[in-house]
């Protein structure tokens, strides 16, 4: 693994993809989605220590300023670098339609 | 302002663009950048309450699951939606060069 992918806090503690099992009710979708009834939601969770999966120059700056001024500048945070599309069968005024969402499930993660 | 832009926590508490004055030393750039000597770093800071500047469907999901499982799923976090480019005069082995960085200064912010 690249240096930027080795978590100094211990395995699984740093920014990475997690899967959370959720029902339509959990997601607040019960009133407008018919299928799926449950979703394996992939999302980015974990700490962003120095140099870990830094997305860009901005993330480097943010980390340096966070170390200097931790009360003013937060540490970078773990967010999706890209997404996997997902199709939903959703209720409409007249019935149902299929809609693909490109920004629903995280595919991989980085620190920004 | 749209509902998603009105901060329920009070003015200036939610995710927005902040400017932090930083020297080359602060940024850890003193050994490779000549100019500028100081930077007005724009970055995204602030809380991401429900429905505030949600970047996409994923952010909505994350907030709903955070309310259900706050110990497992973190709230969405405030990150750049886009960047402003910045030019640096940087030291090279033979002298100096000008380099434009597209991902250095946050231009606007959203919650992911």
């Amino acid at each position: 693994a690249r240096n930027g992918d080795r978590c100094p806090l211990g395995p699984g503690r740093c920014c990475r993809l997690h899967t959370v099992h959720a029902s339509l009710e959990d997601l607040g979708w019960a009133d407008w989605v018919l299928s799926p009834r449950e979703v394996q939601v992939t999302m980015c969770i974990g700490a962003c220590p120095s140099q870990f999966r830094e997305a860009n120059m901005h993330a480097q700056i943010k980390m340096n300023l966070h170390r200097l001024k931790p009360d003013t500048v937060p540490a970078p945070c773990c967010v999706p670098a890209s997404y996997n599309p997902m199709v939903l069968i959703q209720k409409t005024d007249t019935g149902v339609s299929l809609q693909t969402y490109d920004d629903l499930l995280a595919k991989d993660c980085h620190c920004v | 302002a749209r509902n998603g832009d009105r901060c329920p926590l009070g003015p200036g508490r939610c995710c927005r663009l902040h400017t932090v004055h930083a020297s080359l030393e602060d940024l850890g750039w003193a050994d490779w950048v000549l100019s500028p000597r100081e930077v007005q770093v724009t970055m995204c800071i602030g809380a991401c309450p429900s429905q505030f500047r949600e970047a996409n469907m994923h952010a909505q999901i994350k907030m709903n699951l955070h309310r259900l499982k706050p110990d497992t799923v973190p709230a969405p976090c405030c990150v750049p939606a886009s960047y402003n480019p910045m030019v640096l005069i940087q030291k090279t082995d033979t002298g100096v060069s000008l380099q434009t960085y597209d991902d250095l200064l946050a231009k606007d912010c959203h919650c992911v």
Epitope: L34, S35, P36, N84, P85, M86, V87, L88, I89, V96, L98, T100, L104, L105 | -
Partner: antibody, heavy 118, light 107 residues
Framework: QVTLKESGPGILKPSQTLSLTCSFS??????????VGWIRQPSGKGLEWLAH???????YYNPSLKSHLTISKDTSRNQVFLMITSVDTADTATYYC??????????WGQGTTLTVSS | DIVMTQAQNFMSTSVGDRVSVTCKAS??????VAWYQQKPGQSPKALIY???YRYSGVPDRFTGSGSGTDFTLTISNVQSDDLADYFC?????????FGGGTKLEIK
């Protein structure tokens, strides 16, 4: 615009292997929740579901035919394949592929006709 | 396997009439039933999902109802263009199974 099109040999002899291809456009099998199924219909008769493949490569088969069926996909080329080994005259039918998101076949191909005859 | 029975193989109706096509499941399938229309010489087209939800673009003359084991597709104000076979399908459990179909004839 979603389209699916089946292609096959048209005529086979008993005991031969049937290879069918479903070429589609307008959607991707890398999309979570998306699938493609194969359904057949003997002339003048009802519909019989054969197999289904999902975005995550999960595969389901009709138990009555499972030992003869293999479904696969090439996600990058937008194609799904069905292989039926050891065909018989009872396999004479029109074979359809259909987009099946969450078990709902909302778009169907035009069908390809197979005749099994010695 | 779950058997889907469409008791009527043929139904005859007139333009403007209302007709109901029925489908019975051999065991409880909740509302996990779809309906398809197949016009002569064509491939099937989706009409109804989850027993009662019209698929986008389907005229509101088509209405689905039922849950458990008994399901109905109702066509009101029948048009000559509705001449077709109508199939129910359960997707509650594998294998997916279809009814034998009901052919709608226009007098």
């Amino acid at each position: 615009q979603v389209t699916l099109k089946e292609s096959g040999p048209g005529i086979l002899k008993p005991s031969q292997t049937l290879s069918l291809t479903c070429s589609f456009s307008g959607f991707s099998l890398s999309t979570s929740g998306m699938g493609v199924g194969w359904i057949r219909q003997p002339s003048g008769k009802g519909l019989e579901w054969l197999a289904h493949i999902w975005w995550n490569d999960d595969k389901y088969y009709n138990p009555s035919l499972k030992s003869h069926l293999t479904i696969s996909k090439d996600t990058s080329r937008n194609q799904v394949f069905l292989m039926i080994t050891s065909v018989d005259t009872a396999d004479t039918a029109t074979y359809y592929c259909a987009r099946g998101a969450y078990d709902f076949f909302d778009y169907w191909g035009q069908g390809t006709t197979l005749t099994v005859s010695s | 396997d779950i058997v889907m029975t469409q008791a009527q193989n043929f139904m005859s109706t007139s333009v403007g009439d209302r007709v109901s096509v029925t489908c019975k499941a051999s065991q409880n399938v909740d509302t996990n039933v779809a309906w398809y229309q197949q016009k002569p010489g064509q491939s099937p087209k989706a009409l109804i999902y989850s027993a009662s939800y019209r698929y986008s673009g389907v005229p509101d003359r088509f209405t689905g109802s039922g849950s458990g084991t008994d399901f109905t597709l109702t066509i009101s104000n029948v048009q000559s263009d509705d001449l077709a076979d109508y199939f129910c399908q359960q997707y509650n459990t594998y294998p997916y199974t279809f009814g034998g179909g009901t052919k709608l004839e226009i007098k």
